[in-house]
Interface confidence: low
């Protein structure tokens, strides 16, 4: 398991804004976001995004194919660009990944997991925010 | 600089409640976490719980759920934890203590509570 | 719960020692630990974080170390300030939990 507190936490950041977010929002298009109840959390910024790989990559009984989409595939160049030694946690896990059945239809629990990652994005932008903000304060 | 102000002391009888107050300043308040933990004499540090200032947002230690709740007044950057139903056990001190990546940079004084008839 | 055991739970040192407290998570934390020191009718005071990082105007004769279930942390030359306890805790997500604490007392 890869220990992310090393990360660019705003490059990561940068991103997500940029790319990730329109990806995640496009999976998620015909779902309103109350449709599912968040139930994954996280308190920090390292541990959203031990959180957001664990649940963008590994796979789960009821949707096995997450890793395979746009948002995932990005998600996993964003990691391996500013994490330093991401890339090198994850050749087993690549491996692993090309053993894995294609789905054809995005079930429901795939739906629920990317609404679940939504919001530990938002966590992690929200603490994220909440450094800058601090970090301005101190210097105005 | 950074303060998170606390009363001293509390006496309160058992069965009752008690409302105490963290006053912060000298950063913006919303800005970071506010969380509570508790050591009794001679004893740990145990953690209760979090509020986040900026939408209220709490999460409680199971152990501690509906003994403490956490809210906060933003207007007078103040957190308040109320524990309810006291008992000889809740005898401690309580610290606030601010945090974003979960660990705790500034804490404040401690206030003593006593449950005592 | 991450229940965190620390040791030892307390030893006796002379001025100018080097000494060594240790904690261990019962699971992976990967960096997620803090060290704190606690002075008789004192708030704890922030020492470490993520392990290894230094806080703001701690000397640089505190050290940390460690990661996953195994963490040290070490004081070199110790001073007179230095006696006290001194809290492991880690921050990988809730509950927060803290060791037990380990004091250091004069010799």
């Known amino acids: 398991m890869y220990d992310f507190t090393n990360c660019d936490f705003q490059k990561i950041e940068a991103d997500y804004l940029r790319t990730i977010s329109k990806d995640l929002i496009t999976y998620m298009s015909g779902t309103k976001s109350t449709d599912f109840n968040n139930t994954v959390s996280c308190s920090n910024r390292p541990h959203c995004l031990t959180e957001i790989q664990s649940l963008t990559f590994n796979p789960t009984p009821r949707c096995a194919s997450l890793a395979k989409e746009m948002f995932a595939r990005k998600t996993k160049a964003t990691l391996a660009l500013w994490c330093p030694g991401y890339s090198e946690t994850q050749i087993n896990a690549t491996q692993a990944m090309k053993k894995r059945r294609k789905r054809k239809v995005t079930t429901n629990k795939c739906l629920e997991q990317v609404s679940q990652l939504l919001g530990l994005w938002r966590r992690f932008i929200r603490t994220l925010l909440k450094k800058q903000l601090e970090h301005h304060h101190h210097h105005h | 600089q950074v303060q998170l102000q606390q009363p001293g002391t509390e006496l309160v009888k058992p069965g009752a409640s008690v409302k105490m107050s963290c006053k912060a300043s000298?950063?913006?308040?919303?800005?970071?976490?506010m969380h509570w933990v508790k050591q009794r004499p001679g004893q740990g540090l145990e953690w209760i719980g979090v509020?986040?200032?900026?939408?209220?947002?709490?999460t409680y230690n199971q152990k501690f759920k509906g003994k403490a709740t956490l809210t906060v007044d933003t207007s007078s950057s103040t957190a308040y934890m109320q524990l309810s139903s006291l008992t000889s056990e809740d005898s401690a001190v309580y610290y606030c203590?601010?945090?974003?990546?979960?660990?705790?940079?500034?804490w404040g004084q401690g206030t003593t509570l006593t449950v005592s008839s | 719960d991450i229940q965190m055991t620390q040791s030892p739970a307390s030893l006796s040192a002379s001025v100018g020692e080097t000494v060594t407290i240790t904690c261990r998570p019962t699971?992976?934390?990967?960096?997620?630990l803090a060290w704190y020191q606690q002075k008789q009718g004192k708030s704890p005071h922030l020492l470490v974080y993520?392990?290894?990082t230094l806080a703001e105007g701690v000397p640089s004769r505190f050290s940390g170390s460690g990661s996953g279930t195994q963490f040290s942390l070490k004081i070199n030359s110790l001073q007179p300030e230095d006696f006290g306890i001194y809290y492991c805790?880690?921050?990988?997500?809730?509950?927060?939990?803290f060791g037990g604490g380990t004091k250091l007392e004069i010799k």
């Open positions: 203590t601010r945090s974003l990546d979960g660990y705790y940079d500034y």
């Open positions: 509020i986040d200032p900026s939408d209220s947002d709490t």
């Open positions: 699971e992976n934390i990967y960096s997620y």
């Open positions: 000298g950063y913006t308040f919303t800005t970071y976490w």
């Open positions: 993520f392990a290894r």
């Open positions: 805790q880690h921050h990988y997500g809730t509950p927060w939990t």
